[in-house]
């Protein structure tokens, strides 16, 4: 092909020419190309108008092309270019007009390019620039040059992993001249040991990230005090997993934050084994969002009921026991992948609407009632990937629930009463792989609004699917895969007029019957793959609903013998519905094993067996 040795990803639009030992820009790529990846080619030098042949380019990746020199007007023809990636080029000579002509550039990535200063970086004319990434360079001064006042659209400035040690008042002078309240600034992994008090006074930022910046606690404290006067929407402090410098916090570690205006706060990778952490977070009592990620903490019972947090996130943390959370204003709680607390204990969160308690290995002595969470406003509840959850209440006081996820937790007492009876607003329910054995036809009673029901990986009494869906008149998606099912009631699906997707795969059905699907006028997808279907269980195979668009019968045990001729012919008649038809193979007789069912010539001159 004309574009070879490059790879055509999207014809005329996207080409990948990665690591092809090109010394120059290829000339066999279509004029209309919008995305071009030239990374890992030894281009070394970019002269003027290097990309004249690609006026439509929007994304250009020149990572690790050994580029040392970029001449004036190298990108001159690229008026549509929005993203330019120069990562890992040992640039020694950058002409003043190197980036001229880039009138639409929004993202410039100059990571690891030997950049020693922002002052000499010729980007002052790039008025459309939204994101500038100059991480992993040799920048020592945080002084933002005067030309930054032209970059009025700048939203992200990544200066992480540079050599910045000191931040002075004069460094941020330009920010006072421009209303850049949308700017997110990442200074992580710079060896900061001094921030001049007042440097950030009356500065507004969208986000400030300071991770693994400080060699010790005292430096951190004084630097935080140096941030006084800053107004920041989101502040991220802490360290990285593999870059740990700080010993254990003391209660005054974050005192300086009292002099900042913060909307959202996140702390990452730290150890806070304090007896009483209320002192540590007192200055953060009024933030709207509070997040601890990978923090080792003794206990959080000391959060005050009066803290005004609306969103609390505790992820991958270590606790001595499940925290007693009592917070008046909290609307969202994400408590996931934590270690230490094995048993859930009730929380008092009267404003809570969203609760994610997934992946903690928690056991619940009872579930579920408003008294567990202290709220009647809950709409979203995720208890997936936990331990034993004993269903001892039918969601009394939690009638507002719309989303409920128990997947891969061990549900007990599911077949003793109609657990979900009061959940008339529930739209989504996942009880997949919950060790549920359905032995009670009223298991789903009350779920009048349910649209999605996932119950894969469970089991049924006598491996028979009874009429358990009678209330689910709004159901559109039903997953019954991996349930060891062998038979189903002919009327099991009779009330599911809105059902669009039905997954019956990975069960133990030996025959196919179209009768149970006659009352499914909206059915579009029916998956019967990975069963043991040999034939139909009656000679009169009716048609599936006319709405059906995809029928998956792959990986079954088709009996390609004369006695099943009508069934095999019926399968052929459904050809336009079949998904991956080539994977539908004969299992018997042995001489036809592995043959595609659709390629059989069914004339009953087949060997009678």
């Amino acid at each position: 092909e004309s574009w070879e040795p490059c790879v055509e990803v999207v014809p005329n639009i996207t080409y990948q020419c990665m690591e092809l030992k090109f010394y120059k820009i290829p000339d066999n790529i279509p004029f209309s190309t919008k995305n071009l990846d030239l990374s890992f080619n030894p281009l070394r030098h970019l002269g003027s108008y290097s990309f004249l042949r690609f006026p439509e380019l929007q994304v250009l990746d020149l990572s690790r092309c050994e580029i040392q020199t970029i001449e004036d007007g190298a990108y001159q023809s690229l008026s549509h270019l929005s993203t330019l990636i120069l990562t890992g080029n040992p640039i020694q000579s950058l002409a003043l007009g190197a980036f001229s002509g880039l009138s639409s550039l929004q993202k410039l990535v100059a990571v690891e390019t030997n950049l020693a200063s922002l002052e000499n970086f010729p980007i002052g004319h790039l008025k459309t620039l939204k994101e500038l990434n100059v991480a992993h360079n040799l920048i020592q001064s945080f002084k933002l040059p005067e030309y930054f006042s032209n970059l009025t659209n700048l939203e992200h400035l990544d200066l992480s992993s540079n050599k910045i040690q000191n931040i002075y008042c004069k460094d941020l002078q330009v920010l006072h001249q421009m209303p850049l309240s949308n700017l997110s600034l990442d200074l992580s992994l710079n060896p900061i040991n001094f921030i001049q008090p007042g440097a950030f006074k009356e500065i507004r930022l969208h986000k400030l990230t300071l991770r693994s910046n400080f060699d010790d606690l005292n430096v951190m404290k004084t630097c935080i005090q140096g941030l006084a006067g800053l107004e920041v929407h989101r502040l991220v402090l802490g360290e990285f997993r593999n870059e740990r410098n700080l010993e254990e916090f003391d209660k005054s570690s974050l005192e300086g934050l009292c002099n900042l205006t913060i909307e959202e706060f996140r702390l990452t990778y730290l150890d806070c084994y304090l007896d009483n952490i209320i002192d540590l977070f007192n200055c953060l009592a009024n933030v709207s969002s509070f997040s601890l990620v990978s923090v080792n903490i003794k206990r959080v019972e000391d959060f005050s009921y009066n803290f005004r947090w609306q969103h609390l996130e505790l992820v991958n943390c270590k606790f001595e026991q499940f925290p007693t959370l009592e917070l008046k204003s909290l609307k969202r709680l994400t408590f996931t992948a934590n270690k230490g607390g094995n048993a859930f204990s009730e929380v008092d969160l009267p404003s809570l609407e969203f609760l994610d308690l997934s992946r903690n290995g928690l056991s619940f002595k009872g579930c579920c009632s408003q008294s567990d969470f202290g709220t009647t406003s809950l709409k979203y509840l995720d208890l997936s990937f936990n331990d034993v959850i004993t269903m001892s209440s039918n969601f009394l006081g939690l009638e507002q629930l719309e989303h409920l996820d128990f997947q891969h937790s061990n549900l007990k007492q599911m077949s003793q009463f109609s657990v979900f009876l009061s959940l008339r607003n529930l739209i989504y329910l996942d009880i997949s792989h919950t060790h549920t054995r359905v032995a009670f036809n009223g298991i789903f009673d009350g779920l009048l609004s349910l649209k999605v029901l996932k119950m894969a990986g469970n089991s049924f009494q006598e491996n028979f699917l009874p009429d358990i869906f009678t209330d689910l008149k709004n159901l559109t998606f039903l997953d019954l895969s991996q349930c060891q099912l062998e038979q189903l009631s002919p009327t099991a699906f009779d009330t599911l007029n809105k059902l669009q997707v039905l997954n019956m795969s990975h069960n133990n059905f030996f025959s196919l019957d179209t009768f149970p699907y006659k009352c499914l006028p909206s059915l579009q997808v029916l998956d019967y793959s990975l069963n043991h279907i040999m034939t139909s269980n009656n000679q009169e195979l009716q048609h599936f609903p006319s709405s059906l668009a995809f029928l998956n019968l792959t990986q079954n045990d088709f009996a390609c013998t004369c006695e099943h001729q009508s069934f095999l012919q019926w399968i052929k008649d459904q050809r336009q519905l079949l998904v991956e038809a080539e994977r539908m193979e004969c299992a018997t007789p042995s001489d036809k094993q592995g043959m595609p069912v659709l390629s059989l010539n069914i004339t009953c001159q087949m060997n009678k067996t």
């Epitope: 009066n306 009592e326 009730e346 009872g366 039918n394 006081g397």
Partner: antibody
């Protein structure tokens, strides 16, 4: 409105077992919350004794652990206290109460006085 | 267990006067402290939860404050119907414990 009502004998002999029942109306005890016993010796302060959670789980004050049992009958919507080997110091007004999600008690029974005496 | 010490044990106050009752915890309990009023031959009644949050229906003259180990219940302008014993209770950890009580008498 949730209402709680204690009942049981007002006089128990030393070394016997004290048995009280709390009848709950206005809320099913299996539906949520935890259901507690608290006592108050005459002229003294309040002592928390233990509870039964709506799931049937129980927990007790360590000072009473060896003598106390709390059970329930969901069909009658009531829960019960048994305190064995009683002595005169167990003479008190016994209250049943419902604890809210926070560890406080908005609903109490009116209390019943139990005297331990021969 | 957490020990709650109330003071004073007894207070005799004239109507319209301000009453202050303190409760001290043996360890920090954040604001997980609740106040009850108990009148003779009645069961306790919840007044304040979480140190400072008045329960609906409770007169506004009752207020609470404090955090950590030191807490205060204030009755701003005492009325005759306020004659009762007042108890603090910690909800920070089990076993739940109560203060010894403060009896408020009308002069």
């Amino acid at each position: 409105q949730v209402q709680l009502q204690e009942s049981g004998p007002g006089l128990v002999k030393p070394s016997d077992t004290l048995s009280l029942t709390c009848a709950v109306s206005g809320y099913p005890i299996w539906g949520g919350y935890s259901w507690h016993w608290i006592r108050q010796p005459p002229g003294k302060g309040l002592e928390w004794m233990g509870y039964i959670h709506y799931s049937g789980y129980t927990d007790f004050n360590p000072s009473l652990k060896t003598r106390i049992t709390i059970s329930r009958d969901t069909s009658k919507n009531q829960f019960s206290l048994k305190l064995s080997s009683v002595t005169a110091v167990d003479t008190a007004v016994y209250y049943c109460a419902r604890k809210d999600s926070g560890n406080y008690f908005p609903y109490w029974g009116q209390g019943t006085l139990v005297t331990v005496s021969s | 267990e957490i020990v709650l010490t109330q003071s004073p044990d007894f207070q005799s106050v004239t109507p319209k006067e301000k009453v202050t009752i303190t409760c001290r915890a043996s360890q920090s309990i954040s604001d997980h402290l609740h106040w009850y009023q108990q009148k003779p031959d009645q069961s306790p009644k919840l007044l304040i939860k979480y140190a400072s949050h008045a329960i609906s229906g409770v007169p506004s003259r009752f207020s609470g404050s404090g955090s950590g180990t030191d807490f205060t219940l204030t009755i701003n302008s005492l009325e005759a119907e306020d004659a009762a014993t007042y108890y603090c209770q910690q909800g920070h950890s089990f076993p739940l414990t109560f203060g010894g009580g403060t009896k408020v008498e009308i002069k």
